[in-house]
């Protein structure tokens, strides 16, 4: 630690007098304090020697040695007064900026320990301090108003008792600065704005602050607008808004409008953007496919997004048939708006029926006209399957019928034993039908398919097997030949695979 | 070794307010003086003022209306703002350590600051 | 208009002494201690002689400093090409109560 010379801390001094401060370390050192006229300084190695052969009463002040070089970073002081009777403060400052809640020192000096008893703070033109300002004194340092106020920022002067009156020290701003947690906060409505040409719009643009140092204006396309402001402090923060009216818009008028406002902490920004159209319109679109297949016994939820300027006049849902007359019930259409302009409709199916295949239709309505979006709904289903011996020119024959969603495949197995269903081990022969005639494919109802298999014995210790499958789902008929005529089984249950 | 720098933008428009941030590293900013210092091109050095780590402030009466500087101790940094300027007010700004005699050592290495619409 | 007066520029050939001056006042020269700085083109200001005559850590000793009165001057011996730069002085201001400098010597090294 560095040692100063003369070893006090404090000196007190008269006008005119020589003072000469000498600091000694290890290392080189380097003297710290008010800076002020007279000082002459001298540096020789390890030792910094501060002196003027003329002080003033502005050469009152603590004065620090440090040693850059030391780790610990250590320090020494001591306190100058240069006690001239005209002149009982040194002021080191005109201006004290601080944040609220913050100690606030106000820099004022006393050049004579002596007076220390009688000293006050005043505000300017001898005005009292404000209710509740808590403060205290220090003759190094000078007063310091504790956890200062906004409102506490004022201008303050020293006082201090010589010979019974009081002399007042050259005043002192203090700026106590509100605590500013980050760029004011925006708002710019409306979020996203459409009109037809030649009718009127308003976009306003309003920022606020706890602090009334901000800017806030509106920019089109990154040209600033000139709008007049209208200010307000509400809910202890300061409002800024600027509001553009257009009575007749026109194509000029669209594009990007930006909201900035920015204050010592920064620049916030919001956009919008602006839509001059010549004319209403209405547009409707599914992220869906438009051709939907859902499996019997699942639900489906149909989607339609749209777009419209003026807003709609009216919407619904329409069944178009094959089936019924039967129309989708209110409760399960559902409105959801994303915004002004875009809208999602969706109408939820659950637990589809056979019966509620078909084209259901989205109409919507605006000044713009009537819109429609119309969705083919087709029904899967797993095959049914039955077989039947029957004799097709002279020849015997089995006849397979299939039906189900997609077009079912099928696959004949002769297998060995009385059996519901031919299993691995057992199967002798197996055929696939690649081609099996479709007897009938209407839009949104089954497929039926018929295969044949010629058979010239029948083996009476044999089954025959229909099997068919689509991606839903397979199903198979046994026909097992008894001497008594031929005899069909159906499997135990119907296979089933929603 | 304390070093300094200055940062801010480099262009401001007329009437607009000037807003500079000096760092300090390599050393405490508290219990020191710190000073702004500008320099037009071509031109010589004039000071702006000073700030001392507990707010207090001493600006150039030339300038005094207009400036304001605070510090912050908690991020080794003192600012400057200059508000209302104009095309006279385009300089090299510096930021720099007073020291006890009035001296300025060391500088930051200097922020060009244009003021022009 | 700068408070303190230098000369516009100075030159000296390698090796030579140059001398470069500045006057000012009894607010400011008069009364106070006088600094000077060395600024290298495109560089910001160091601190070349303090408290008149005073050379940081650093600072060869063909530099040095006095002051006499109102006026203060800075010597540099044995010019080199690189003390090529412009010089100011600056000084305490008691009416300021704040430094004030000079407007600056162009030094060229012939």
């Known amino acids: 630690i560095p040692v100063i010379e003369p070893s006090v801390p404090e000196l007190v001094v008269k006008p005119g007098a020589t003072v000469t401060l000498r600091c000694v370390g290890n290392g080189s050192v380097e003297w710290d304090g008010p800076p002020s006229p007279h000082w002459t300084l001298y540096s020789d190695g390890s030792s910094s020697i501060l002196s003027t052969n003329n002080a003033t009463f502005q050469n009152t002040g603590t004065y620090r040695c440090t040693e850059p070089g030391d780790p610990l970073g250590g320090s020494a002081a001591i306190h100058l007064y240069v006690k001239d009777p005209a002149r009982p403060w040194n002021v080191l400052a005109q201006e004290v900026v601080v944040f609220e809640d913050q100690d606030a020192l106000l820099p004022c000096l006393l050049t004579d320990p002596v007076l220390e008893a009688g000293v006050s703070l005043v505000r300017v033109r001898g005005r009292p301090l404000m209710r509740h300002t808590n403060y205290s004194f220090s003759p190094w340092h000078g007063f310091t108003i504790h956890r200062a106020k906004f409102i506490q920022s004022q201008d303050y002067q020293c006082s201090a008792l010589m010979g019974g009156r009081k002399v007042m020290s050259i005043s002192i701003r203090l700026k106590v600065q509100k605590v500013i947690p980050g760029p004011p906060a925006l708002t710019l409505v409306p979020a996203e704005l459409v009109r037809i040409r030649g009718e009127a719009a308003q976009i306003v643009c309003s920022a606020s602050s706890v602090d009334v140092n901000f800017d806030v204006f509106l920019q089109h396309n990154n040209t600033k607008l000139a709008i007049p402001q209208q200010s307000d402090f509400h809910n202890n923060r300061y409002q800024k808004v600027l509001t553009l009216n257009l009575d007749q818009v026109d194509f000029q008028h669209a594009g990007n409008y930006s909201c900035v406002a920015s204050n010592v902490q920064g620049k916030h920004s919001t956009s919008m953007f602006f839509r001059v159209v010549e004319s209403a319109y209405l547009n409707l679109s599914s992220e869906q496919n438009l051709i939907q297949e859902v499996t019997v016994g699942e639900g489906l939820n149909l989607k339609v997004m749209v777009e419209a300027y003026p807003g709609l006049q009216g919407f619904n849902w329409t069944y178009l048939g094959p089936f019924s007359d039967h129309q989708p019930e209110p409760k399960l259409a559902n409105a959801t708006t994303k915004d002004t302009y875009r809208h999602t409709f969706t109408l939820s199916l659950p637990r589809l029926k056979p019966s509620e295949a078909g084209r259901y239709s989205f109409l919507a309505r605006n000044p713009g006209g009537w819109r429609a979006l119309t969705f083919e709904l087709t029904l899967r289903y797993p095959p049914e399957v039955s077989v039947i011996w029957t004799f097709i020119n002279g020849s015997g024959t089995l006849l397979c019928a299939a039906s189900g969603y997609p077009q079912p495949n099928v696959t004949w197995l002769q297998c060995s034993g009385h059996t519901d269903r031919c299993d691995e081990a057992q199967v002798l022969q197996v055929w696939d039908d690649p081609y099996p005639e479709v007897l009938s494919q209407e839009p949104f109802h089954k497929v039926t398919v018929q295969s044949l298999l010629t058979v010239e014995t029948l083996e009476h210790n044999q089954t025959y097997e229909c099997r068919a499958h689509n991606s839903v789902g397979s199903g198979s008929w046994a026909f097992i030949p008894i001497s008594a005529g031929a005899h069909t089984h159906p499997p135990d249950e119907f296979l089933f695979t929603p | 070794q304390v070093q300094l720098q200055e940062s801010g933008p480099g262009l401001v428009k007329p009437s607009e307010t000037l807003s500079l941030t000096c760092t300090v590293s390599?050393?405490?900013?508290?219990?020191?003086?710190w000073s702004w210092i500008r320099q037009p091109a071509g031109k010589g050095l004039e000071w702006i003022g000073r700030?001392?780590?507990?707010?207090?402030?001493k600006y150039n009466p030339s300038l005094k209306s207009r400036v304001t500087m605070s510090v912050d101790t908690s991020k080794n940094q003192f600012s400057l703002k200059l508000s209302s300027v104009t095309a006279a007010d385009t300089a090299v700004y510096y930021c720099?350590?007073?020291?006890?005699?009035?001296?300025?050592?060391?500088w930051g290495q200097g922020t060009l600051v244009t003021v022009s619409s | 208009q700068s408070v303190l007066t230098q000369p516009p520029s100075a030159s000296g050939t390698p090796g030579q002494r140059v001398t470069i001056s500045c006057s000012g006042s009894s607010s400011n020269i008069g009364s106070n201690t006088v600094n000077w700085y060395q600024q290298l083109p495109g560089t910001a200001p160091k601190l070349l002689i303090y408290?008149?005559?005073q050379r940081p850590s650093g600072v060869p000793d063909r530099f040095s400093g006095s002051k006499s009165g109102t006026s203060a001057s800075l010597a540099i011996s044995g010019l080199q090409s690189e003390d090529e730069a412009d010089y100011y002085c600056a000084a305490w201001d008691d009416s300021l109560n704040g430094p004030v400098f000079g407007g600056g010597t162009k030094l060229t090294v012939l």
């Open positions: 408290s008149n005559n």
């Open positions: 700030i001392y780590t507990s707010g207090s402030t």
């Open positions: 390599g050393g405490s900013i508290s219990s020191y003086y």
């Open positions: 720099a350590r007073e020291g006890v005699t009035g001296g300025f050592d060391p």
